[in-house]
């Protein structure tokens, strides 16, 4: 019979024949032959392979180094790598999450649009007219100006993006 030019899923072509790939969590020791099956071996502790493969070496688990602000989000297994995230108040510097930086604070005049997570930084937005923020914070949104009218008061000092309005008593009309 003609030697195959393509193989089924979870197989690979070697020496004109189709061999079974090793399952996730195992590495290749020897290719199959006419008479023997593919020989695979489990990955060692703290190693993994996450696909059907013909790798001769397993990959090492990622180390979530606490000195870099990292912590384990998901423990590694023979079939999956360790997933790292950042300690509270920090976020990853890249998608691979190899180190962490402190969450950014929004300056006065800006409020938090989106609170930071372990993988994304704080998103700030300028306080629009009618809102203010007088603190530097990683959590505070822009606050609406105080409504003097609802308190039967009048605006004595206009608000800005950094300060609230100042309310005062209405001037009594003289007789």
């Amino acid at each position: 019979p003609e030697p195959p030019t393509a193989c089924r899923e979870k197989q690979y072509l070697i020496n004109s024949q189709c061999c079974s790939l090793c399952q996730p969590g195992q590495k290749l020791v020897s290719d199959c032959t006419e008479f023997t099956e593919t020989e695979c071996l489990p990955c060692g502790e703290s190693e993994f392979l996450d696909t059907w493969n013909r790798e001769t070496h397993c990959h090492q688990h990622k180390y979530c180094d606490p000195n870099l602000g990292l912590r384990v989000q998901q423990k590694g297994t023979s079939e999956t790598d360790t997933i790292c995230t950042c300690e509270e108040g920090w976020h990853c510097t890249s998608e691979a999450c190899e180190s962490c930086v402190l969450h950014r604070s929004c300056s006065p005049g800006f409020g938090v649009k989106q609170i930071a997570t372990g993988v994304s930084d704080t998103i700030c937005e300028p306080c629009p007219v009618g809102f203010f923020s007088n603190v530097s914070s990683a959590f505070e949104k822009c606050h609406p100006w105080t409504s003097c009218e609802t308190k039967d008061l009048v605006v004595q000092q206009a608000g800005t993006n950094k300060t609230d309005v100042v309310c005062g008593p209405q001037d009594r009309l003289r007789a």
Epitope: C43, G44, E47, Q74, K75, T77, E79, D81
Partner: antibody
Framework: EVQLVESGGGLVKPGGSRRLSCAAS????????MHWVRQAPGKGLEWVAY????????YYADTVKGRFTISRDNAKNSLYLQMNSLRAEDTALYYC????????????WGQGTLVTVSS | DIVMTQSPDSLAVSLGEKVTMNCKSS????????????LTWHQQKPGQPPKLLIY???TRESGVPDRFSGSGSGTDFTLTISSLQAEDVAVYYC?????????FGAGTKVEIK
Amino acid sequence: EVQLVESGGGLVKPGGSRRLSCAASGFTFSDYGMHWVRQAPGKGLEWVAYISSGNRIIYYADTVKGRFTISRDNAKNSLYLQMNSLRAEDTALYYCARQDGYRYAMDYWGQGTLVTVSS
Amino acid sequence: DIVMTQSPDSLAVSLGEKVTMNCKSSQSLLNSGNQKNYLTWHQQKPGQPPKLLIYWTSTRESGVPDRFSGSGSGTDFTLTISSLQAEDVAVYYCQNDYTYPLTFGAGTKVEIK
């Protein structure tokens, strides 16, 4: 037969130090991750620390971070726990336990060694 | 940290009766890569160290009698002893094997009525 034998426990004064050992036999020690887990008298289990088979990865519980150091000597089939700045709340039976690369669970435990921190 | 909550704290059951205990985790123990729940059960008999009973929620460790079974997923798990034997008197601990720090439940003590 897999055997894990802890030693080094005893009475220590608060602020003192102690080094625990765990002698492993009956398996290829260098192929396994290892843990220390403790159990205060009459209480439940508390994980303390982990070290990977090749010494590359080490994790600690927050309660012992900066005070305890886990290490291993694969040539001597031994696991260690160096305990410094000991506190009364560290009083417990300390177990070493093995973690394999398949289950990723603690599949064998030693008998434990008792550390008592008291003045 | 993941908090493991076991219930009940203790239970007394007649020999041959069915025993059910529960374990709840404060977050999912499902590994997104291999779709296994990393929930482990350990048995600790009086005066002895813990012994691995069940891993990956429902896989019995070699040598563990088939009267022991585990079930559940995500955050809710159950250990069942189908017919209690005298040698099953112990404290049973569930454990988060999903992430560090590894955390244990406070245990469920099983006694004979």
